[in-house]
């Protein structure tokens, strides 16, 4: 019997200061570039080494970005989302959704010597 995979979803406000080379991450998604099935949201696909996001440490690959400086990222074309980040100014506030995978053991077996439970 296989364990069930659950997700713990949390939201966080991350304030980044644009560095010499920018914010330091890549994104995927948008209404014209669905990265996740049935979800046109904007996701972090890469954190650049030594960039502003990496040095801050809170933004993670796979995070969904819900808003930039209070502006909702729902139903945006991919390039419009990219442009929104590029024009976001020096101090950038990101509302992000972290999705942490939680591995549960088989029902009725957790807590019985299984360290993954």
């Amino acid at each position: 019997m296989n364990g069930r995979v659950d997700y713990l979803v949390t939201e966080e406000e991350i304030n980044l200061t644009r560095g010499p080379s920018g914010l330091g991450f890549n994104i995927v998604g948008g209404t014209d570039q669905q990265y996740v099935s049935n979800d046109s949201g904007i996701y972090v696909s890469r954190i650049k080494e030594n960039g502003a996001a990496a040095l801050d440490g809170r933004l993670q690959e796979g995070d969904k970005i819900l808003s930039v400086n209070g502006q909702d990222l729902k139903n945006l074309l991919h390039q419009d989302a990219v442009d929104l980040f590029r024009n976001a100014g020096y101090a950038v506030s990101l509302r992000v959704q972290h999705r942490l995978q939680v591995q549960n053991g088989p029902i009725g077996h957790r807590g019985e010597g299984d360290p993954s439970g």
């Epitope: 994104i27 570039q33 996701y43 990219v82 590029r86």
Partner: nanobody, 127 residues
């Protein structure tokens, strides 16, 4: 992981043409920015051309502008480099590279450090 396989290299006379292809694995090819780089013996790897996820934006090194054309076919998971008016100084190993997603900072994708995956390369020799 993404796998990139280049083909189309070879030996050609100066003034001739070649078309390089780079086939990529993975269902999310249409989200990658793609680039071509080259490395001549004893020299550093240098940027040649790049194309964004949709094919709507391209960028070229000054040395190849007007001679090389980068394009992509997302239905075929393939990016191309059409090389015309080849010169002996174009002789190098040509590498295809993929960057996952669009940089929120850079428009040109000319920095090798922006790329996540690299092919093994294909040799182009111009005599």
């Amino acid at each position: 992981d993404v796998q990139l396989v280049e083909s189309g290299g070879g030996l050609v006379q100066a003034g001739g043409s070649l078309r390089l292809s780079c086939a990529a694995s993975g269902r999310t090819f249409s989200t990658y920015a793609m680039g071509w780089f080259r490395q001549a013996p004893g020299k550093e790897r240098e940027f040649v051309a790049a194309i964004n996820w949709s094919g709507g934006s391209t960028n070229y090194a000054d040395s190849v502008k007007g001679r090389f054309t980068i394009s992509r076919d997302n239905a075929k998971n393939t990016v191309y480099l059409q090389m015309n008016s080849l010169k002996p100084e174009d002789t190098a190993v040509y590498y295809c590279a993929a960057a996952i997603g669009s940089s929120v900072d850079s428009y040109d994708h000319s920095d090798p450090l922006e790329y996540d995956y690299w092919g093994q390369g294909t040799q182009v020799t111009v005599s």
